[in-house]
């Protein structure tokens, strides 16, 4: 053996291999990556684990391993096996794990695997398998996991699977399967996980998943499906469903009616245009629903019975209104993204107490009422950019203590209510041409980034102080000071703010000191210092 020292390794450790005793005085033998072209011959009968992976073994002579009655795991991955004869694994009564991946098998061995009664895990992935003989798995009564991915199968080997009633997880991914026949998995009543991703599946039998009564995860991603997989309706225990990256154009009414346990559905990267309004009803475990660019949707989906939804994204559709009681259906919603729709009016969202992020940009909203966002105590981000908002109720944002990001850019605002926005760190108001007033920076002690319609409005946020320093370097003998600025532009402040001028100026100077770290754009810049901007604004 290869392990040195006085603690003699039991006889039967092949040369160059690494051997150690397991807790039961059985031998773990690692002969991986040694350039072996044949099996070592002097293996101990007491071997429980044998790793022969990453060698150059091209043949498994029948009965060479038959004495290894304690062998529980045999690794033959990454060799050059093209064929495994009948009898190759005879006598391996304890074998639980057999790894044959990354070889050159063109078919599953017809008889070699039969009656391995203890076998629980079988890896046949990454071979060139195009044929699975009907009885090749017979007698594998304990098999739980089967890997057949990354092969050359064109059909599901229906007959071969009939004997695998104990199977719990199987992958047929990365093959060339084009159709799934009715009852293809009809006897796999214990199967929990089924991976069929990265095939060429374009059609599914109406009953192709019938019999999969325990199935919880079904992966149909990256296929050629052009219709919704209605065959899922019998999968009453399904929790995770993926059919993203297909060619599905519509999701029918009551699409998931037979799958009340669904937690996750992945269906992005499909050219979905239409979704039945009842498609996502009665999914009490669903947490996330994301649908982008379904341009034929005109009505907000009915989500009765889908009350645990935490994230709802429905962008790029033609939804023009939300139900008044939308939050009665969605009390657990944390993220609501309805950007790029045709929403004009908003109901009160105050029932959605857990909302943290709302994105309503690129809609047709014209007014924010006082009740719309009332008492959303957890709301952190609100995006209302690119709408037609001309009116915002003075108290619209008054009960949003957690709000840190507010985007109202590219609207029609002429005034902006500041009540309740003292926690903001990000504020965007750019693109509101009618918004000419200065916004008192004292209302935003936490502000880090602000975007304003005009450069002069940045002066209230430390733009002047910063620019003053810069302009001092450019025009050192200018004699400009903050006092000069006050004198020059007193008229402006009187026009823009009705507070006592002196108070305002004191506040303004305090702000300049406190808020020097605020990034405000458009920046006045060195060639347009605040004093000039104020001046030119007065002329305007």
């Amino acid at each position: 053996g290869s392990s040195p020292g006085p603690d003699a390794i039991p006889r039967g450790c092949p040369s160059h291999c690494h051997c150690e005793l397991d807790g039961r005085m059985l031998l773990r033998v690692d002969c991986s990556d040694l350039g072996l072209s044949e099996l070592p011959s002097n293996l101990s009968v007491f071997t429980s684990y044998l790793d022969l992976s990453m060698n150059n073994i091209s043949q498994l002579p029948a009965s060479l391993l038959h004495r290894l009655c304690f062998l529980e795991e045999l690794r033959l991955a990454g060799n050059a096996l093209t064929h495994i004869p009948k009898g190759a694994f005879t006598g391996l009564h304890s074998l639980k794990v057999l790894m044959l991946q990354n070889n050159q098998l063109r078919q599953v061995p017809e008889e070699a695997l039969q009656n391995l009664r203890s076998l629980q895990s079988l890896r046949l992935d990454a071979n060139h398998i195009s044929y699975v003989p009907p009885s090749c798995f017979s007698g594998l009564h304990s098999l739980r996991h089967l890997w057949l991915d990354d092969n050359a199968l064109t059909d599901v080997p229906v007959q071969a699977f009939r004997s695998l009633s104990a199977l719990q997880a199987m992958t047929l991914a990365l093959n060339k399967i084009h159709h799934i026949a009715d009852y293809a998995f009809g006897n796999l009543s214990s199967l929990v996980v089924l991976h069929l991703h990265n095939n060429r599946i374009h059609s599914l039998g109406k009953k192709c998943f019938d019999g999969l009564h325990s199935l919880e995860t079904l992966d149909l991603n990256y296929n050629n499906l052009d219709e919704f997989p209605t065959a899922i309706k019998t999968l009453s225990n399904l929790k995770e469903l993926g059919f993203h990256s297909n060619n599905i154009r519509s999701i029918p009414e009551r699409a998931f009616v037979g799958n009340p346990s669904l937690i996750t559905i992945h269906f992005y990267d499909n050219p979905i245009q239409f979704v039945g309004v009842s498609a996502f009803q009665h999914l009490p475990e669903l947490r996330t629903l994301t649908l982008n660019g379904a341009s034929h949707i005109t009505e907000f989906p009915h989500l009765t019975g889908t009350a645990t939804l935490e994230s709802l994204t429905l962008t790029g559709a033609k939804i023009s209104s939300l139900p008044q009681a939308v939050c009665d259906q969605l009390p657990n919603l944390q993220v609501l993204d309805l950007s790029y729709n045709l929403l004009e009016d908003l109901p009160s969202l105050s029932g959605c107490q857990k909302l943290q992020k709302i994105d309503l940009r690129h809609n047709e909203i014209y007014e924010i009422k006082g009740s719309t966002f009332q008492q959303l105590f957890n709301l952190r981000s609100l995006n209302l950019a690119w709408n037609k908002i001309a009116i915002i109720h003075p108290n619209a944002f008054s009960t949003l203590p957690s709000l840190i990001k507010l985007d109202l850019s590219s609207n029609l605002l002429s005034s902006f209510p500041v009540t309740g926005l003292h926690g903001l760190t990000h504020l965007k108001l750019t693109g509101n041409r009618a918004l000419q007033s200065l916004i008192p920076s004292a209302n935003f002690p936490e502000l880090k980034i602000i975007e304003m319609p005009s450069a002069y409005q940045c002066c209230a946020f430390g733009g002047c102080e910063n620019v003053y320093k810069i302009s001092n370097q450019w025009n050192k003998d200018d004699g400009n000071s903050v006092d000069d600025l006050h004198k020059k532009d007193a008229g402006l402040f009187q026009v823009q703010d009705e507070r006592d001028l002196e108070d305002f100026l004191l506040d303004f100077e305090e702000d300049l000191k406190a808020l020097h770290s605020v990034q405000c754009s458009p920046s006045p810049g060195p060639f347009k210092p605040c004093e000039h901007l104020f001046g030119s604004w007065l002329i305007r």
Epitope: A181, T234, R254
Partner: antibody, heavy 118, light 111 residues
Framework: EVQLVQSGAEVKKPGASVKVSCKAS????????IEWVRQAPGQGLEWIGE????????DYNEKFKVRATFTSDTSTSTVYLELSSLRSEDTAVYYC???????????WGQGTLVTVSS | DIVMTQSPDSLAVSLGERATINCRAS??????????MHWYQQKPGQPPKLLIY???NLESGVPDRFSGSGSGTDFTLTISSLQAEDVAVYYC?????????FGQGTKVEIK
């Protein structure tokens, strides 16, 4: 224990309609198809069609497509067969059965005798 | 429609003897290696009872004297040793394609 319990016998006049119910228990109702089969007196078995309870999925024998309607009520785990425009040759025992292993009919209701007579 | 034809129409067999019923489909009912052919037993006044599914698989709880064989279009139900309680009408059925169809039935009696 899987059970399918059907409604009682009916006597109908020609041209009328009949609605037969089939209440399922002992298994996940929406996970198995329910088949409808009829048997005229002294005759063989004739498949009418099938429904997957709770869904909109149905299949009808072309012969019955116009006159038969299958519905289901998941709240009571009940499936219904309605047959309209009854004729005397519709006199038969109507069975519901569960589509089990590979579509074989593994559990059957006790049958409902529908007699059509003027 | 696929037509199922059973033979014989009736069969009288001595107790303990073998009974064989044939069923022929007008076209193959095989799909991906599965034969979508099932056998049922019906006793008077009772609904049918599933015996064999997919041509040869014994339904749970059915005595092993019943067996099925065949593929494609020709199928056989065999009772290896007829018992008194086996007196009934036996039907074959295909569910390979809609409409699912039954054979006309074979009546098994004791000789």
């Amino acid at each position: 224990e899987v059970q399918l319990v059907q409604s009682g016998a009916e006597v109908k006049k020609p041209g009328a309609s009949v609605k037969v119910s089939c209440k399922a228990s002992g298994y996940t109702f929406s996970a198995y198809w329910i088949e409808w089969v009829r048997q005229a007196p002294g005759q063989g078995l004739e498949w009418i069609g099938e429904i997957l309870p709770g869904s909109d999925s149905t299949d009808y024998n072309e012969k019955f497509k116009v006159r038969a309607t299958f519905t289901s009520d998941t709240s009571t785990s009940t499936v219904y067969l309605e047959l309209s425009s009854l004729r005397s040759e519709d006199t038969a025992v109507y069975y519901c059965a569960r589509g089990g292993h590979y579509g074989s009919l593994d559990y059957w209701g006790q049958g409902t005798l529908v007699t059509v007579s003027s | 429609d696929i037509v199922m034809t059973q033979s014989p129409d009736s069969l009288a067999v001595s107790l303990g003897e073998r009974a064989t019923i044939n069923c022929r489909a007008s076209e193959s009912v095989d799909n991906y290696g599965n034969s979508f052919m099932h056998w049922y037993q019906q006793k008077p006044g009772q609904p049918p009872k599933l015996l064999i599914y997919l041509a040869s698989n014994l339904e749970s709880g059915v005595p092993d004297r019943f067996s099925g064989s065949g593929s494609g279009t020709d199928f056989t139900l065999t009772i290896s040793s007829l018992q008194a309680e086996d007196v009934a009408v036996y039907y074959c059925q295909q569910n390979y394609e809609d409409p699912f169809t039954f054979g006309q039935g074979t009546k098994v009696e004791i000789k």
